[in-house]
Interface confidence: low
């Protein structure tokens, strides 16, 4: 299953398959999710060891049993792979590392006026992986505002340096934020020239081209048919970068097929996973496992379920059959690609599904990290989960946020619907960003149900949370993702990092902003809240978040929306935006609904009708 | 609310130096940048340098480089320019300004410099 | 350094008109640009700035457009009150610069 849990000042012994340096634990993590292998990793942040070479040291590693030993390392973080665990699963990172220098090859650098500025012209550049950007107090003047373009071999650091008045961080073309768009056509008889990056074996140029995607040198490809003249060549698929980004020549070639990596898309990239199934047709590989299984999508199912388990062979060998069942062979290989891809057997072959991040499991996310006032544009994909909340009667509005928890249910406040009980005049967008974006022919979902607390009453403060579940399941993209639920009984002092987010009133008197606005915000304590609102009770179901002096809030058209904070580099739903005196008014912080307190109610009404929850909170 | 208070104005004779300050209040004042920009008769506003008060790292116009030194007091939440060989072209209203994102979102009320022999 | 080169550097005009003051900016400043208001004795206030727009206090008659060196802040309907000196300022690299400056006059 899915294990998200870090360990902190633990370093797990043995089993590595591959080190690198990255700048934090997280990344540390998206890599060994990414990695063919790797089920484990430790990393050593620069505070937790003297060794200057293996300081930001990230190890991945693998073992047969699921787990190693883990020794007392002061400062290392260890935890799991995220394979197996949907929609968590994205190579999207979009933390800037500030007082940090990562290195590799300089091959651009020019002057911009922000970091920003120069994660944007890093995900603009095909070659770019990362960058780091000297500010304007950076103590040589004539590097001051440099924006350096990187990348290396590996798509990591050749090494992670602190530095003052240095920032750095990684490419958002993972992110489908790239500017630069993509190839999607195939050209069938053509072979591309230029460098290999790495040769591995695939049964079609679709598999091919989503390898090509997430590998990190990756540009373009050549594939060779499995009827291509030279047998050994065979289902290779070649892996190719230029220093133009694009092929400097193709060559007409029969059983040849070339195409580009997806990775500069925009708003879409290919699952990182392979979901075709092969019929007549084996995988050669490392064998984990051999069990008897009733039909070859039961196959599938046993190799994703079996973490180590990379693709299969299901055969229909009479040999290997006995009743309904024949023999699941699951196998596994150093890249993750089949050693050897045979033809005209009796066999069907396929692969893990462990990448796939529509997986229905824990609606836990840790990816982004009433105008809100004092906020600022977000950005594609920054907060996956919020979601518009309209009503068409003659003409439409947005009138609520809401946040997505599961493939079909919404969290919001209750008293949205006051006045507006009718599901038939909803309509929920997701997955958006400028209200402007949207036309009469944009896909919305509509209310199957709304559920609405029990002890809500109108005009009323307390219990203002509803669940809405939607007439059909959202899948999820790196748009459109849930968020993750406290724990039972979350004590929101642990939260430092919390942010409001909607599309509601700038000011007090304002109207309905067009780009999702964000603001960080500090959580204020419930006693502290209880002072400046004494004609109310705060309870402690309720969570209060502002600034002393006011300036930023949520407002008019927030309300329902998320307040999420980010805890070990996982972000939760806190609260729901409900109630305050005006907007950001100095001393008059914003009420919450605090949602940790609804959990069993949020639980108890998702079940779906085998009783089976449709959604849980973190371990 | 932010508020951003300069010291009264000055004259100075040519070849001195002035000492100008600024008063943050409103919000934290280490985690803002605090920038000098002056307004001269003939030249209109001209950015001279800024100063993060958290790291105390400054970045200079190149055009200023070597007279213009900016400091900061953060126990009293104060930014201070000091420009130093003073000239009659130096005559000009001095601001301190806080950026929002990057332009100036807060302005000090000015300080007039006169240099006057 | 880049140089912002503003024009009109003043102008007459009644209350009611229609106002537009250019800003060029001698190399592309990638929309890394800020209007601010001046009046007399009184420092700047910061009225637009890059591709959100307005600033909160101003009136939605202001507004600003233009790419790469080229930008115009445009009054649709010129009231008492913005009667002022109007700079443009280029925050996309140091040294930041700003436009000789716009008086608008009333006529």
């Known amino acids: 299953g899915c294990l998200t849990q870090l360990y902190e000042n633990a370093f797990f012994r043995g089993g590595d398959v591959a080190s690198m340096y990255t700048p934090n634990a997280q990344y540390c993590q998206m890599r060994c999710t990414f990695h063919p292998r790797c089920l484990l990793f430790s990393f050593l942040p620069a505070s937790s060891i003297n060794d200057m070479e293996k300081r930001f040291g990230c190890f991945l590693k693998d073992s047969v049993t699921g787990t190693l030993p883990k020794v007392h390392r002061t400062g290392a973080v260890s935890g799991h792979s995220l394979k197996q665990c949907g929609h968590q699963i994205s190579a999207c990172h979009r933390d800037i590392y500030k007082g940090v220098d990562m290195r590799g090859v300089n091959f651009n650098v020019s002057k911009v006026s922000s970091v920003e500025e120069c994660q944007k012209r890093c995900t603009s550049n095909i070659r770019c992986q990362f960058f780091s950007y000297a500010t304007q107090t950076f103590h040589k003047a004539e590097y001051r505002n440099n924006c350096l373009l990187k990348y290396s071999p590996g798509g990591t650091p050749t090494a992670i340096k602190v530095l003052s008045n240095v920032e750095s961080g990684f490419s958002l073309k993972p992110c489908a934020l790239s500017e630069i768009g993509c190839h999607m056509n195939i050209f069938q008889h053509l072979a591309f020239s230029d460098v290999d990056v790495a040769r591995v074996l695939t049964p079609d140029a679709f598999v091919c081209r989503t390898i090509c995607t997430y590998h990190p040198n990756c540009l373009f490809f050549t594939f060779y048919t499995n009827v291509w003249k030279i047998e050994s060549q065979r289902n290779v698929c070649l892996l190719k970068t230029s220093e133009s980004g694009t092929p400097s020549s193709s060559t007409p070639q029969e059983n040849t097929i070339s195409g580009y990596s997806l990775l500069t898309c925009k708003r879409t990239l290919p699952e990182p996973c392979h979901s075709k199934i092969y019929p007549g047709v084996d995988f050669g590989g490392e064998e984990l496992n051999v069990t008897f299984v009733k039909g070859v999508n039961v196959c599938q199912e046993t190799c994703t379920k079996m973490i180590r388990c990379q693709f299969f062979t299901y055969s229909l060998l009479p040999e290997d059959c006995k009743e309904e069942k024949c023999k699941c062979f699951l196998r596994l290989s150093m890249d993750g690609s089949p050693t050897r891809i045979a033809y005209g057997t009796q066999g069907s072959s396929g692969y893990s599904l462990r990448l796939c991040n529509t997986g229905d499991n824990s609606v836990c996310t840790t990816k982004t990290s009433t105008r809100i006032v004092g906020g600022t544009n977000s950005s594609w994909g920054e907060w996956p989960w919020q979601v518009s909340l309209q009503v068409k009667l003659t003409a439409q509005r947005h009138l609520c946020g809401g946040s997505l928890i599961g493939h079909q249910w919404v969290l919001t406040a209750a008293h949205c619907f006051d006045g507006l009980p009718l599901q038939d005049v909803w309509r929920i967008y997701s997955g958006i960003l400028n209200l402007s974006d949207i036309t009469k022919d944009t896909p919305f979902s509509q209310i199957k149900e709304i559920i609405i607390h029990q002890n809500y009453k109108v005009s009323e403060g307390n219990h203002d949370i509803a669940l809405i579940k939607l007439q059909a399941p959202l899948n999820y993209t790196e748009f459109q993702k849930p968020i993750c639920l406290p724990s039972k009984g979350d004590t929101s002092t642990i939260y430092t990092n919390c942010w409001v987010t909607g599309w509601g009133f700038s000011k007090e008197k304002g109207e309905i902003q067009n780009i999702l606005q964000k603001v960080n915000i500090p959580l204020v304590t419930n006693e502290e809240c209880q002072k400046r609102y004494q004609d109310y009770k705060i309870t402690q179901r309720m969570v209060c978040a502002g600034y002393k002096e006011g300036g930023k809030d949520a407002c008019k058209g927030d309300s329902g929306g998320p307040l999420v904070c980010k805890h070990n580099g996982m972000w939760r739903l806190v609260g729901i935006t409900s109630w305050g005196e005006g907007c950001a008014r100095r001393e008059q912080p914003g009420v919450y609904t605090k949602v940790a307190e609804y959990m069993d109610w949020i639980l108890e009404k998702t079940q779906s009708s085998d009783g089976k929850a449709q959604m849980q909170s973190p371990a | 609310q932010v508020q951003l208070v300069q010291s009264g104005a000055e004259v100075k004779k040519p070849g001195a130096s002035v000492k100008v300050s600024c008063k943050a209040s409103?919000?934290?004042?280490?985690?803002?940048?605090m920038h000098w920009v002056r307004q001269a008769p003939v030249q209109g506003l001209e950015w001279m340098g800024a100063?993060?008060?958290?790291?105390?790292?400054?970045a200079y116009n190149q055009k200023f480089k070597g007279r213009v030194t900016m400091t900061r007091d953060t126990s009293t939440s104060t930014v201070y320019m000091e420009l130093s060989s003073l000239r009659s072209e130096d005559t000009a209203v001095y601001y301190c300004?806080?950026?929002?994102?990057?332009?100036?979102?807060?302005w000090g009320q000015g300080t007039l410099v006169t240099v006057s022999s | 350094d880049i140089q912002m080169t503003q024009s009109p550097s003043s102008l007459s005009a009644s209350v009611g008109e229609r106002v537009t003051i250019t800003c060029k900016a001698s190399?592309?400043?990638?929309?890394?640009l800020a209007w601010y208001q001046q009046k007399p004795g009184k420092a700047p206030k910061l009225l637009l700035y890059?591709?959100?727009g307005l600033e909160a206090g101003f009136h939605l008659r202001f507004s600003g457009s233009g790419s790469g060196t080229h930008y115009t802040l445009t009054i649709s309907s010129l009231q008492p009150e913005d009667f002022a000196t109007y700079y443009c300022?280029?925050?996309?690299?140091?040294?930041?610069?700003f436009g000789q400056g716009t008086k608008v006059e009333i006529k």
């Open positions: 300022q280029q925050y996309w690299s140091t040294p930041w610069t």
């Open positions: 100063i993060h008060p958290g790291s105390g790292g400054t």
């Open positions: 300004a806080r950026p929002y994102g990057y332009p100036f979102a807060y």
């Open positions: 409103g919000y934290t004042f280490t985690d803002y940048e």
């Open positions: 190399e592309d400043i990638y929309n890394r």
């Open positions: 890059g591709e959100t």
